[in-house]
């Protein structure tokens, strides 16, 4: 039960006090007791319950009422059973007793009131009225946890607007209200109660720029909502009528968890005694609700696809046809960004990452816009954000970014268990340098901080700075699987490729050509590739880099070797010893459920079939996956990217609720 106020009683004049239902009020009977009195007894109206604790127990008088010694060991507390119909309608009488004097009486007139701030602290999607209870003030994780949840109102329900809904202090319509969390103030008081008392709703100054509270007046219509708390307003006096009354508030978060904001927001209602005009108002009671701002959550390849994004650029019609066909097979919506909007920037994966935010009453997809800001920079904000589609960005918006700030360098694993630690929403993966040096590339600290602050997908730093482009999607991917952990990790593997080519040469296919059918490309015989010592040395270095990540992933994701599939792939070291794919990088694939769009490798044709394609199919088809090889050679591969780099996917949110985990 919540702590109420302390009431001091005195025999000199009657005391008037307010007692909030659900709170425990302390009664100070000792400090004003007559000097020659040594004990006291208590009589109350039926609506008041008094509890007296003392060691040793008191003696019972023959009249039936008990007396207690007047000493500091006595604790008197009272609670009220119901709200008062009129002011002071409940009474407590303290009788002080002494050996030589008649009893001296002290009177306490109590007014019982109900004042409670409620929100969906049980996370059921409904607000249940709660009396003032201690546990509303704490937010706990896990299936038995409690505490309310707020969404950042980061979508744009008004198609005419260019701003996010949380950037204005208006409620557009009932759709906009659904992005907010309901909070209800319930009051039950005597009719004249608020002539002498006032309620104030407030938020800490340190949190005021993270939240906005709208008060719904006269019904719940959006047009009747007005801002009462927000970035410019940490407190608001409430006009509350006497009697029984419910007041609804709609709460929106304005900021995601981040370095200096753990995501918790406390809203408090304070009851002030304003009865003495010449004196400052005194706090009589406070009730609070703690909200946690819902984190931004990424979705792995194992989640069902819902929408595919791709760019239309000069001469990529065939690529578009292939992606369109794949999206149709996977029953996905397809969104094509036209040339006039992408400004010759085809790297859809690098521009954005689509995740979601979730509260018990609402789930919202949210696009995380990377700070790379090339030709596609307007696409997330102008074409993706919209009604029920949120937006967030981090990092410098002008300069100061590296290639590692593009979101081909941001992936997430499927759910994993590492020892005793469960990651039911998977773990974020991003690439970094091995160690900081004058020219090493890292993901911008603002991005790293944001990702870590979400708490629910603890990030893992991989090593990717050895690549020309430097993105994790150049050497890893995840595909769904029907067994084991429900997925396989795919890793690019020069070792596996050399093994395959060696086998083909041993079988007499050393003259088979890589890049057959590619115009203006020097075709390479298997035997020449195998005998090129420089290329072998380069791939030995690449293998070491990938193996470093392999061990890191096994450790951080709790994987065994049998959870990993090696995809044959060769790399070449280019300027400044940075690696890029020697032939189209097959691990850089588009995963749409069981349908995979894999870069066509143009490997050696043996018995009428590309041996690289055949090998990959033999590895993935037993998992129930369907491999489609997409020609991206001229439009993507020679520009340092592949199918995954050129596409993006919105996926179905997890069925697992983030608040049920323990980070």
């Amino acid at each position: 039960m919540a702590q109420g106020t302390l009431i001091r009683v005195t025999p000199e004049q009657p005391t008037h006090a307010v007692c909030v239902l659900g709170t425990l009020t302390q009664l100070d009977v000792c400090s004003s007791a007559p000097e020659d009195c040594t004990s006291f007894s208590v009589n109350t109206s039926p609506g008041v319950v008094v509890d007296i604790a003392h060691s040793p127990p008191a003696k019972k008088k023959s009249t039936g009422s008990s007396t207690w010694p007047l000493d500091p060991g006595v604790e008197v507390t009272l609670t009220m059973k119901a709200a008062s119909g009129s002011t002071g309608d409940q009474k407590v009488q303290i009788s002080y007793h002494g050996p030589k004097t008649p009893p001296v009486k002290a009177l306490l007139y109590l007014t019982g009131v109900e004042i409670s701030l409620s929100a969906d602290i049980t996370r059921t999607g409904k607000v249940k009225p709660t009396r003032a209870v201690e546990d509303k003030r704490t937010w706990t994780w896990g299936p038995c946890g409690q505490g309310a949840i707020l969404l950042v109102n980061c979508d744009r329900d008004n198609p005419e607007s260019s701003a996010m809904d949380c950037e204005d202090d208006e409620v557009l319509d009932s759709k906009d209200l659904k992005d907010m969390s309901l909070m209800t103030l319930s009051t039950k008081t005597p009719q004249d109660f608020f002539t002498r008392h006032t309620l104030v709703l407030h938020v800490a100054r340190s949190e005021m720029d993270k939240v906005r509270v709208f008060q719904a007046t006269r019904g719940r219509l959006s047009s009747r909502c007005r801002v009462v708390l927000g970035p410019k307003q940490p407190s608001h006096y409430l006009m509350v009528p006497g009697g029984k009354h419910n007041m609804d508030f709609y709460v929106e978060a304005l900021a995601f968890p981040d370095t200096n904001f753990p995501g918790l927001i406390t809203l408090t209602v304070s009851m002030l005694d304003t009865s003495k005009l010449e004196l400052p108002e005194a706090v009589v009671f406070q009730d609070s609700v703690v909200f946690r701002v819902a984190p931004w959550i990424m979705t792995p390849n194992t989640q069902p696809p819902q929408e595919v994004y791709v760019c239309s650029i000069f001469e990529n019609e065939d690529f578009l046809k292939s992606v369109t066909a794949l999206a149709m097979q996977a029953r996905c919506k397809l969104t094509i960004c036209p040339e006039e909007e992408n400004m010759d920037d085809q790297w859809m994966q690098d521009e954005m990452e689509i995740g979601y935010i979730q509260a018990p009453h609402k789930t919202l997809p949210v696009v995380f816009d990377s700070p790379r800001n090339r030709g596609l920079k307007e696409f997330p904000i102008k074409r993706v954000m919209g009604p029920d589609f949120g937006y967030v960005t981090r990092g410098p918006q002008t300069g100061g970014v590296s290639g590692l700030d593009s979101f081909g360098n941001l992936e997430v694993s499927p759910p994993v268990t590492v020892g005793d630690k469960e990651y039911p929403l998977g773990r974020i993966l991003f690439g970094d340098s091995c160690y900081p040096s004058s020219d090493s590339r890292e993901m911008h600290q603002a991005l790293q901080d944001f990702l870590s602050a979400q708490q629910v997908q603890a990030p893992v730093k991989l090593y990717s700075d050895w690549l020309t482009v430097g993105h994790v999607d150049e050497f890893l991917s995840f595909v769904p699987a029907p067994d084991r952990k429900g997925f396989r990790l795919l890793l690019a593997s020069p070792r596996s490729c050399y093994k395959l080519f060696q086998e083909q040469q041993n079988e007499g296919h050393g003259d088979a050509l890589l890049f057959q059918g590619i115009k203006k490309k020097n075709q390479q015989k298997i035997k020449n590739i195998l005998s090129n010592t420089t290329l072998r040395e380069h791939n030995s270095f690449v293998e070491r880099c990938i193996d470093w990540n392999r061990e890191l992933l096994k450790r951080e994701l709790g994987l065994a070797e049998s959870d990993i599939i090696d995809i044959p792939q060769l790399f070449k070291l280019k300027e400044f010893s940075k690696a890029e794919a020697f032939f189209p990088n097959m691990v850089n694939m588009l995963v749409l459920g069981k349908h995979l769009g894999i870069p066509k490798p143009f490997g050696p044709i043996i018995n009428g079939r590309c041996c690289l394609e055949e090998k990959v199919c033999s590895l993935l088809e037993p998992l129930g996956l369907h491999c489609t090889f997409i020609n991206d050679f001229y439009t993507y591969h020679i520009r340092h990217g592949e199918v995954h780099c050129g596409t993006n996917v919105r996926r179905k949110p997890f069925s697992f609720k983030w608040w049920n985990m323990v980070p």
């Epitope: 020309t468 430097g470 280019k574 300027e575 520009r639």
Partner: antibody, heavy 128, light 111 residues
Framework: QVQLVESGGGLVKPGGSLRLSCAAS????????VSWIRQAPGKGLEWVSF????????YYADSVRGRFTISRDNAKNSVYLQMNSLRAEDTAVYYC?????????????????????WGRGTLVTVSS | QSALTQPRSVSGSPGQSVTISCTGT?????????VSWYQQHPGKAPKLIIY???ERPSGVPDRFSGSKSGNTASLTISGLQAEDEADYYC???????????FGGGTKLTVL
């Protein structure tokens, strides 16, 4: 073959900033590595900065690191050198140079380390 | 002070051969085969004449040749001509924090 033209040079006070541009014609600059080289009056060549064709990594000389930023806009067929906190010793003719990033290369041909096409240069004078 | 060391000047008569040396360390010239040479006439932009130690871009006469031994690279110009009079700079990839280094330049005078 690509032709390069530098612009943006001029007189600036110590501590000031300038942004040099290198515009390409005759070919698509996105296929080229680009470097900036400078030459102080009467002195030798000094390598300043490099950006790769994919626009994914950059390098700088110790003497300019943290003050200069190289960037490219392939849509505009241009490369830029943003120079901040300029010092008297940055006074020089700044050359933009490039080398083709040939996808046919099997192994590192060193194209990022040599400059086969040069612009005419733009003079930057840092003086109070 | 330049990172790669070249003689300040060399000279030769028309028809003769001259060699310009470029000395670095085991972290640049000695480590990589990414040595290049540039010719610069007064008031003009430099011009690439040798790359990757000994390769010549198209249009560069075969009188210009490059070589490397240990930490020293060399440019040899045979059959000197009057138009060869210019400044010559060597350059190398380096594993230091400045990844491309130039020599201080050598003034070639054709007598």
């Amino acid at each position: 073959q690509v032709q390069l033209v530098e612009s943006g040079g001029g007189l600036v006070k110590p501590g000031g900033s300038l942004r040099l541009s290198c515009a390409a014609s005759g070919s698509t600059l996105s296929d080229y590595f680009v470097s900036w080289i400078r030459q102080a009056p009467g002195k030798g060549l000094e390598w300043v900065s490099f950006i790769n064709s994919a626009n994914t990594f950059t390098y700088y000389a110790d003497s300019v690191r943290g003050r200069f930023t190289i960037s490219r806009d392939n849509a505009k067929n241009s490369v830029y050198l943003q120079m901040n906190s300029l010092r008297a010793e940055d006074t020089a003719v700044y050359y933009c140079s490039s080398a083709n990033d040939d996808v046919d290369d099997i192994v590192a041909p060193g194209r990022g380390y040599y400059m086969d096409v040069w612009g005419r240069g733009t003079l930057v004078t840092v003086s109070s | 002070q330049s990172a790669l060391t070249q003689p300040r000047s060399v000279s030769g008569s028309p028809g003769q051969s001259v060699t310009i040396s470029c000395t670095g360390t085991s972290g640049d010239v000695g480590r990589y085969n990414h040595v290049s040479w540039y010719q610069q006439h007064p008031g003009k932009a430099p011009k690439l004449i040798i790359y990757n130690v000994y390769e010549r871009p198209s249009g560069v006469p075969d009188r210009f040749s490059g070589s490397k031994s240990g930490n020293t690279a060399s440019l040899t110009i045979s059959g000197l001509q009057a138009e060869d009079e210019a400044d010559y700079y060597c350059s190398s990839h380096s594993r230091s924090s400045t990844p491309v280094l130039f020599g201080g330049g050598t003034k070639l005078t054709v007598l």
